[in-house]
Interface confidence: low
């Protein structure tokens, strides 16, 4: 089935924004929030922000989480505050990570 | 070391103008939104009204009170957020502070410049 | 629009822990944040994003946000910390940008 389309003037949520693509912003406004955990040069990397449009996310954030990727979205004002994503293995930790908080 | 130093200040009749300035160094003032916030003699502070940074569309936010008579405006190439004041009133009498907005918080605050409005 | 309530005052003896409360509906929706003030200075950040410390504020500062409640609360209190404090909540998409009405924290002795 295909996805709803949002509405001519979708509601913007306020998120948490942490990363690179933040600037100096600590929020951002859009369609939906995430909150991210890749794996960069060994390093765990924590990202959260948003999608401005609706398409951006869409793919995003139906993509499953892989051995080195997880996103997981949300709907609604700072939702991805207290979220954060996690790697699919549980309990195995991968070898020579470390938690590396992009701020 | 992130400094802001308000100016402009003074005193002015009711219905009168006056245009306060704000110079900012020690940081990237171009990245940064900017708030002007208020402080009635002997009370709290009031919120007045933001500017984004023109990365985040430039946009200007105002308080109820002062909206359609207040403008913020801000010069990147000068480091300078400014505030114009019009139609100005008796309840406008405060000590006017800068501040860095980092959208949660407001991260560093000038040391203010008292407006008094009075005839 | 949203109102924040402050008790006006509070006193604390040298040592011992103060907590100013800052209530209002839906504040868990939102982050807040803490200033300290000192007579004839402009206000400092002391605690952003409901629990966070800027750097440079002292660990005996903490805060927290849960039920309708922000709570600031100042673990052996000095008596440098007599200021007043202001709790702040925004909420752009909803048009709030909301100070509390301040508390005086006097520290006895």
């Known amino acids: 089935m295909e996805d709803e389309k949002p509405k001519v003037n979708p509601k913007l949520y306020m998120c948490v924004c942490e990363g690179l693509s933040c600037g100096n912003e600590d929020h951002c406004e859009g369609q939906q929030c995430f909150s991210s955990l890749s794996i960069n040069d060994g390093f765990h990397v924590y990202q959260k922000g948003c999608f401005q449009v609706y398409e951006q996310g869409k793919m995003t954030c139906k993509t499953p989480p892989s051995p080195g990727q997880a996103v997981e979205c949300c709907q609604g004002d700072w939702c991805n505050r207290n979220i954060t994503a996690q790697l699919p293995t549980k309990g195995k930790s991968f070898p020579g990570t470390q938690n590396f908080h992009l701020e | 070391e992130v400094q802001l130093v308000e100016s402009g200040g003074g005193l002015v009749k009711p219905g009168g103008s006056l245009r306060l300035s704000c110079a900012a160094s020690?940081?990237?003032?171009?990245?940064?939104?900017m708030s002007w916030v208020r402080q009635a003699p002997g009370k709290g502070l009031e919120w007045v009204g933001r500017?984004?940074?023109?990365?985040?569309?430039?946009?200007?936010d105002y308080a109820a009170p002062v909206k359609g008579r207040f403008t913020i405006s801000r010069d990147d190439s000068k480091n300078t957020l400014y505030l114009q004041m019009n139609s100005l009133k008796t309840e406008d009498t405060a000590v006017y502070y800068c501040?860095?907005?980092?959208?949660?918080?407001?991260?560093?605050w000038g040391q203010g410049t008292l407006v008094t409005v009075s005839s | 629009d949203i109102e924040l309530t402050q008790p006006p005052s509070v006193s604390v003896s040298p040592g011992q822990t103060a907590s100013i409360t800052c209530s209002g509906d839906?504040?868990?929706?939102?982050?807040a944040s803490w200033y300290q003030q000192k007579p004839g200075q402009a206000p400092v950040l002391v605690i952003y994003?409901?629990?966070n410390r800027p750097s440079g504020i002292p660990e005996r500062f903490s805060g927290s946000n849960s039920g309708n409640t922000a709570t600031l609360t100042i673990s052996g209190t000095q008596a440098e910390d007599e200021a007043d404090y202001y709790c702040?909540?925004?909420?752009?998409?909803?048009?709030?940008?909301?100070f509390g009405g301040g508390t005086k924290l006097t520290v006895l002795g």
């Open positions: 501040a860095r907005d980092y959208g949660v918080a407001f991260a560093y």
């Open positions: 020690g940081f990237t003032f171009s990245s940064h939104a």
């Open positions: 500017i984004k940074s023109k990365a985040d569309s430039g946009t200007t």
């Open positions: 839906s504040i868990p929706s939102f982050f």
């Open positions: 994003r409901d629990s």
């Open positions: 702040y909540v925004t909420a752009p998409w909803k048009s709030i940008w909301v």
